[in-house]
Amino acid sequence: EQAPGTAPCSRGSSWSADLDKCMDCASCRARPASDFCLGCAAAPPAPFRL
């Protein structure tokens, strides 16, 4: 859960309590056990800009 009083993370990222900052959901491919990855499952990824 995101820390109270912090700005929401941008699309494609999720709050990490461990690191005290927003982290990229893309990194959950390599590190699925990261605390913030739970928040990524509920949020759609940022779309590709082609």
Partner: antibody, heavy 119, light 111 residues
Framework: EVKLQQSGGGLVQPGGSMKLSCVAS????????MNWVRQSPEQGLEWIAE??????????HYAESVKGRFTISRDDSKNSVYLQMNNLRPEDTGIYYC??????????WGQGTTLTVSS | DTVLTQSPASLVVSLGQRATISCRAS??????????IHWYQQKPGQPPKFLIK???NRDSGVPARFSGSGSGTDFTLNIHPVEEDDTAIYYC?????????FGAGTKLELQ
Amino acid sequence: EVKLQQSGGGLVQPGGSMKLSCVASGFTFSYYWMNWVRQSPEQGLEWIAEIRLQSNDYPTHYAESVKGRFTISRDDSKNSVYLQMNNLRPEDTGIYYCACRYADYFDHWGQGTTLTVSS
Amino acid sequence: DTVLTQSPASLVVSLGQRATISCRASQSVSTSDYSYIHWYQQKPGQPPKFLIKYASNRDSGVPARFSGSGSGTDFTLNIHPVEEDDTAIYYCQHSWEIPPTFGAGTKLELQ
């Protein structure tokens, strides 16, 4: 402010050894994968070693070019990462950078240290 | 290993114009959601500086003049308008697998 302060390097003869060190500050060191990347005119930027986290018993990965000769290690209590280089070859000459990544990109780099392997 | 081929090797651009740098991977480095390509800028005597992650996401503090795009095997870094301070070598890097490899670099110079 994130800082990676490197030490070590210099001139060494072929077949010799050298140890590089890198002390980190300004971020939660124990959560990050630590790496060594080297740069030479011949090979460009070349990733050479990575050490991951204590929670997984510090797994390591190496480039084929250094496997069996180089050893990466870390001391989370000292926010430090090391590269022990043995049986050095002239082609190991270059600038060595320590760099951290959470999973994918190298967001912070040390200032670099030069290694010259020559007789 | 995934090989990254950058082109051109060098590029001369006038102040205020657009610089376009290509990075082609030897295999796809994208999932349906993300592309695992990142861009760096290196100036003489300095370490590489991280610019763009996951093909198109600028690092904090990186000017909007820098933009990245692409998916699969073909990726592009655009700089527009080019400023004097942009003279540097630009590298792409993939994180699809071990080993993470870098492109050979593109040297950007101003006319």
